[in-house]
């Protein structure tokens, strides 16, 4: 269940979608990418407060218990829902393939 | 790609599969379900540094982009990887059922 | 000897299916990336797609929903599956090695000599 | 989708003379270009790859530059052998992939 989409802390500051601008000498792949030079890194940050975009019943379980033990059980976390893929040119033992990674780009965010 | 089991913070520290007790009235279910009256909820808590547990190629971003950019991009998260179901005898508007949740209880943890 | 050849051309009517082969040999398939080129007579050349080493497929955008293209490792073979054809689809079709914009090791000009397709009532 | 564009489509050029090819992108392809060269009844070949890099086996006549959206091709000195069809291809990789040839420059004796 995607419970409410309301940000109770003020726009922007709850678990959403952010670009970040990033090389391959950021990203360390330097080495072994040829392609993109640079990467528009879409990834999950903000936060987590009670019910916002809980993405199963255990996002609401940690919601209840950390609000109880908030030093024991810390508040849901900002991560991706779903993927984009990406393509990247890479070197290979041969030379150069095309490999596509399912799992790099975040598409959208939930709380858990 | 499930990387580093070894944690460099010590033993217990780092992303692994925790148990809290908690009663009806700490998950706020009290009013609509009868059994169990307490849960061991299994929950995933802990540090994820660098490459320890990296769910995906996004996780070893974030690790990456978190060592660049610590105030912009965070640290990777502990979260389920996979979920053991969970039986409740709830109350219904004809009485009682029972029903299965499969998103109730971690089953093991990854760092994402 | 590192070789390419493309067979399966002729002539087809307009709305049939064709499948090109292109059978290669001096390397595996499960290491090197497989691009087809198409070129009309007496016009230019045209991307059509690439099947990587992992088989992961990638096309232009003209060519997606038409044409599929495959591989049989085993056989040493890529194949390029042509539906609901067009007179427009009238070419010769080369299988070449690679992903063309960046060189592998080894041979850096690996092309087939082509197969004519011709589309026509 | 990728367009890449060439100019001029028709150079006229003496032997021994310079020729500059230019290839522009659509989208930023950084240096994923190469450069062909074709001739009557034959595949293309190879002269430059990775936007600059001499393919093995050609003359050191043939130099490439460029990279994102702008491309060039030289032929320092032109041989007879050089007056050709030439083509760039371009690949842009992000959520997918997909190339695209330039329309050609034919080089043809002045």
């Known amino acids: 269940a995607r419970n409410g989409d309301h940000c109770p802390l003020g726009p922007g500051r709850c678990c959403r979608l952010h670009t970040v601008r990033a090389s391959l000498e950021d990203l360390g792949w330097a080495d072994w990418v040829l392609s993109p030079r640079e990467v528009q890194v879409t990834m999950c940050i903000g936060a987590c407060p009670s019910q916002f975009r809980a993405a199963n019943m255990h996002a609401q379980i940690k919601t209840s218990l950390h609000r109880l033990k908030p030093d024991t059980v810390p508040a849901p976390c900002c991560v991706p829902a779903s993927y984009n893929p990406m393509v990247l040119i890479q070197k290979t033992d041969t030379g150069v393939s095309l490999q596509t990674y399912d799992d790099l780009l975040a598409k959208d965010c939930h709380c858990i | 790609a499930r990387n580093g089991d070894h944690c460099p913070l010590g033993p217990g520290r780092c992303c692994r599969l925790h148990t809290v007790r908690a009663s009806l009235e700490d998950l706020g279910w009290a009013d609509w379900v009868l059994s169990p009256r307490e849960v061991q909820v299994t929950m995933c808590i802990g540090a994820c540094p660098s490459q320890f547990r990296a769910a995906n190629m996004h996780a070893q971003i974030k690790t990456s982009l978190h060592r660049l950019k610590p105030d912009t991009v965070p640290a990777p998260c502990c979260v389920p990887a996979s979920y053991n179901p969970m039986v409740l005898i709830q109350k219904t508007d004809t009485g009682v059922s029972l029903q299965t949740y499969d998103d109730l209880l971690a089953k093991d943890c990854h760092c994402i | 000897e590192v070789q390419l050849l493309e067979s399966g051309g002729g002539l087809v009517q307009p709305g049939g299916s064709l499948r090109l082969s292109c059978a290669v040999s001096?390397?595996?398939?499960?290491?090197?990336?497989m691009t087809w080129v198409r070129q009309a007579p007496g016009k230019g050349l045209e991307w059509i797609g690439i099947i990587s080493n992992s088989g992961s497929t990638y096309y232009a955008s003209w060519a997606k929903g038409r044409f599929t293209i495959s591989k049989d490792s085993s056989k040493n073979t890529v194949y390029l599956q042509m539906n609901s054809l067009r007179a427009e689809d009238t070419a010769v079709y080369f299988c070449?090695?690679?992903?063309?914009?960046?060189?592998?090791?080894?041979?850096?000009?690996?092309w087939g000599q082509g197969t004519l397709v011709t589309v026509s009532s | 989708d990728i367009v890449m564009t060439q100019s001029p489509a028709t150079l006229s050029v003496s032997p021994g003379e310079r020729a500059t090819l230019s290839c522009q992108a659509s989208?930023?392809?950084?240096?994923?270009l190469a450069w062909f060269q074709q001739k009557p009844g034959q595949p293309p070949r190879l002269l430059i790859y990775a936007a600059s890099t001499l393919a093995s086996g050609i003359p050191a006549r043939f130099s490439g530059s460029g990279s994102g959206t702008e491309f060039t091709l030289t032929i320092s000195s032109l041989q007879s052998e050089d007056f050709a069809v030439y083509y760039c291809?371009?690949?842009?990789?992000?959520?997918?992939?997909?190339?695209?040839f330039g329309q050609g420059t034919k080089v043809e004796i002045k």
């Open positions: 291809l371009g690949v842009y990789t992000y959520i997918s992939a997909e190339g695209a």
């Open positions: 989208e930023d392809i950084y240096t994923n």
């Open positions: 070449a090695r690679g992903i063309l914009v960046y060189a592998d090791y080894g041979d850096h000009n690996l």
């Open positions: 001096g390397f595996s398939l499960s290491s090197y990336d």
